[in-house]
């Protein structure tokens, strides 16, 4: 029997569905257990317009120790502001700098990524180290990318099409699924129905998918039916915040006994025959109906409280309105320049604008310091002598007051220039992981420890070795040692900074030839970027130190030149 | 508007002294660092001193260190300039100027000090 | 201490184009700003930055800087440009200001 129930999209304000999923495009998941490097490539594809992106790395311990480096090669086809959270991972990151923006600086070893074409950036990820995944996603709000979680089959990733990629992706697409809604005709009553398709995916076994309902009803007011239909390798975890009849395939369980499963029932994989299933269960209004993909978590917010739906009036808009002005990340697109007299802050309109921000005065921490509107920019600017800036030994610092049309209190950020004539750079050669006596001299086929070091230490900035390399003469030629701060060879080790951190890496150095240089200088790149702020604030310096070589040793690792 | 206005210049004889003041208004003076710079007759600009917004700082330059002692007082928007043991080349133009949105953005019309017996 | 050098004077026709070089070691490092001053009268910020106008400054003033040399250029240069001008920076090292020895523009 045909049920009579013309499903019309729902507005957002009647019902929202958000997904996390690791079905991707294109994707692959391979294994590469003996690689010193785990790879990890996304293409990201963004509509036009600064997109706002959240990346969390997630790293599983395998007997107690971390897993190895990593390379996360991001392309991306269009502007990304990107939250990246990477705790404690020892990663490196490829990406196109003219289009991804850090909302803090992102305290890892980055890399500039070619503007290759797909395949190319494979084929430049894999001349790194086999690559353990890559994916494809098409506008994504957040991904979780966890490290060491491999289970592909494979032992080569090469992209496929609809691939699902296991526990190793999770990813949240920005624009919310598409809820339908309609009236059951011919049955009585304020029943509603919110029916959950999740369409079959390409699976490796059991799944759970969590599902969070919030219904915005007081609770009395509420008669509803919750059906969630799925391939039979998928169970329930349902997190609702009212009573409601479950009617689900597979088995559920509820967030508050999740230990406690129960058995469901065969339900149609139809459309139709889901709705046919909610008039059965007496529902007069199918408040909600939504198809997914395979997904972990799906959250479904709805404010009907049955018989009262609304559908959107044709055409339809399926992607929701832009979220409402974001301060935090405003705050972060002050840029901050540094001059040898002045200290500038600058906001660009475009920018601004993007993010649906109305911006009513932006000052530094006194509020007589206003910033001037240049037509394409609010540009704020003072003398360090001047605005409440507050003056230490190796930086001058202030605070950036933005008001904002949408928030009753002003935005506030700290903003800091470097001193650099107060800062002193040094670098230590130690014979011992400890870094405790320091040394001029290296032994071939010795390990040796170096540290950087900058003084008075600066907390607000982050000290980072770009690059360091051996320079032994015209005999001896130059060995590289880091490069876009990652270890060159085998015979060198980016290591943990120290407490203070200082950057710390160790190298062995040995010679295929004669005769073998007495003398080297070691020269090393530094940057001091800020841990909260613009990426424009980078300093570099370049230091040196000289260094005496002794007992020559003809085995090898590192070659000469 | 912002004005400054100069005043205490005059005739003195060499090693003795004199009190430069500099009268602001028409904006936030308590916010700004203030400079005195001073002007030979028929010469170039020749910076004197500096002074933070809320006097933490205060920077000479190597001619005039140790004899001129630059201060403010925010109460009363007042820039300040004690000159001890002056000298014949001490004779010139005194501005000062605010230290604010862009580099010496606003410049008193001067007071003229000559050093001479 | 750190050294500006300007050239003492400089010659342009009306509608012609004027150049003022300031030299310093490493300037281009350095934020340069330009004062104009016409006789009798308190100098004015005329580039601010090596190359921002303030405003009310007309776009024909500009600024440069890099290497050892920073420049000031006036375009379609008019009489009432007949003036000195001084470069300025600030020298970090010492926590002084430093200014040039200044250059007399002179409109033939």
């Known amino acids: 029997e045909t049920v009579h129930c013309d499903l019309q999209p729902v507005g957002p304000e009647r019902g929202e569905v958000t997904y996390t999923t690791s079905q991707v495009s294109k994707g692959c998941v391979a294994q590469a257990p003996n690689a010193i490097l785990e790879v990890h490539v996304l293409f990201l594809e963004f509509p036009t317009g600064p997109s706002q992106l959240e990346l969390t790395l997630q790293a599983s311990k395998q007997n107690g120790t971390w897993p190895r480096e990593v390379l996360l090669v991001l392309s991306v086809n269009s502007s990304v502001f990107l939250h990246l959270q990477a705790l404690g991972i020892p990663l490196h990151l490829a990406y196109n700098s003219s289009l991804v923006t850090f909302q803090e600086p992102p305290g890892v070893n980055t890399t500039e990524l070619p503007s290759f074409p797909k395949t190319q950036i494979l084929e430049w990820a894999a001349e790194r180290g086999p690559i353990t995944s890559a994916a494809e996603l098409n506008d994504p709000q957040s991904i979780l990318l966890r490290l060491g979680q491999a289970q592909g089959s494979l032992s080569f990733c090469m992209l496929e099409a609809s691939q699902d990629m296991g526990r190793t992706l999770e990813w949240r697409p920005r624009t919310p699924a598409l809820v339908r809604g309609c009236h059951l005709e011919g049955v009585a009553g304020h029943k509603e129905a919110h029916i959950l398709r999740v369409l079959p995916g390409h699976s490796a076994g059991p799944r759970t998918v969590t599902v969070k309902v919030e219904l915005s009803c007081a609770p009395g007011d509420l008669d509803a039916v919750l059906i969630l239909q799925g391939p039979p390798y998928v169970s329930w975890l349902i997190d609702a915040n009212h009573n409601m009849q479950i009617w689900t395939t597979g088995e559920y369980s509820f967030k508050i006994f999740p230990e406690k499963n129960i058995r469901g029932f065969k339900l149609p994989d139809t459309p139709q025959g889901l709705l046919g299933e909610a008039r059965m269960l007496n529902a007069s209004i199918v408040a909600s109906f939504v198809e997914l993909p395979l997904a972990s978590i799906v959250s479904l917010h709805a404010s009907s409280c049955g018989g009262r739906l609304q559908t959107s009036p044709a055409p339809i808009q399926t992607t929701p309105p832009k979220d409402t002005c974001s301060p935090e990340l405003l705050m972060s697109l002050i840029q901050t320049k540094c001059a040898d007299d002045a200290m500038t802050l600058v906001l660009k309109k475009e920018l601004v604008a993007h993010l649906k921000c109305t911006i009513t005065g932006l000052t530094f921490w006194d509020p007589s310091c206003e910033a001037e509107d240049r037509g394409d920019k609010f540009v704020l600017r003072s003398a360090y002598s001047s605005c409440g800036m507050q003056v230490s030994a190796s930086m001058i610092s202030n605070e950036a007051v933005v008001n904002i049309l949408s928030s009753s209190s002003p935005q506030r950020k700290k903003v800091h220039c470097l001193n650099m004539d107060s800062l002193s750079f040094q670098l230590g050669l130690y014979l011992s992981p400890h870094f405790l006596q320091a040394s001029n001299t290296i032994e071939p086929g010795q390990q040796s420890f170096v540290q950087v070091r900058v003084s008075p230490s600066v907390s607000e900035f982050l000290l980072q070795l770009d690059s360091c390399h051996l320079d032994l003469g015209p005999e001896g030629g130059t060995v590289e040692l880091i490069q876009g701060r990652a270890a060159k060879g085998n015979c060198v080790s980016l290591l943990s900074p120290s407490p203070e951190g200082d950057p710390r890496f160790s190298f062995l150095l040995h010679f295929y030839t004669v005769p073998i240089p007495k003398t080297g200088t070691l020269s090393c790149t530094v940057a001091l970027r800020p841990k909260t702020g613009s990426q424009d604030q980078e300093v570099h310096r370049t230091v040196f130190m000289r260094l005496n070589i002794i007992s020559p040793d003809l085995s090898g690792c590192t070659s000469k030149g | 508007q912002v004005q400054l206005v100069e005043s205490g210049g005059g005739v003195v004889q060499p090693g003795r002294s004199l009190r430069l003041s500099c009268a602001a208004s028409?904006?936030?003076?308590?916010?700004?660092?203030m400079h005195w710079v001073r002007q030979a007759p028929g010469k170039g600009l020749d910076w004197v001193a500096i002074?933070?917004?809320?006097?933490?700082?205060?920077y000479y330059a190597d001619s005039v260190k140790g004899r001129f002692t630059i201060s403010r007082d925010n109460s009363k928007n007042t820039l300040s300039l004690q000159m001890n043991s002056l000298r014949a080349e001490d004779t010139a133009v005194y501005y000062c100027?605010?230290?604010?949105?862009?580099?010496?953005?606003?410049w008193g019309q001067g007071t003229l000090v000559t050093v001479s017996s | 201490s750190y050294v500006l050098t300007q050239p003492p004077s400089v010659s342009v026709a009306p509608g012609q184009t004027a150049r003022i070089t300031c030299g310093g070691n490493?300037?281009?490092?350095?934020?340069v700003h330009w004062y104009q001053q016409k006789p009798g009268q308190a100098p004015v910020l005329v580039v601010y930055?090596?190359?921002d106008r303030p405003s009310g400054i007309p776009e024909r003033f500009s600024g440069s800087n890099s290497g050892n040399t920073a420049t000031l250029t006036i375009s379609r240069v008019e009489a009432g440009d007949e003036a000195d001008y001084y470069c300025?920076?600030?020298?970090?090292?010492?926590?002084?200001?430093?200014f040039g020895g200044g250059t007399k523009l002179t409109v033939l």
């Open positions: 930055d090596d190359s």
């Open positions: 100027a605010r230290d604010g949105k862009y580099p010496f953005d606003y």
């Open positions: 002074i933070w917004y809320d006097g933490s700082y205060k």
């Open positions: 028409g904006f936030s003076f308590s916010s700004y660092g």
């Open positions: 490493n300037i281009g490092s350095k934020s």
């Open positions: 300025q920076v600030w020298d970090r090292s010492s926590d002084h200001v430093v």
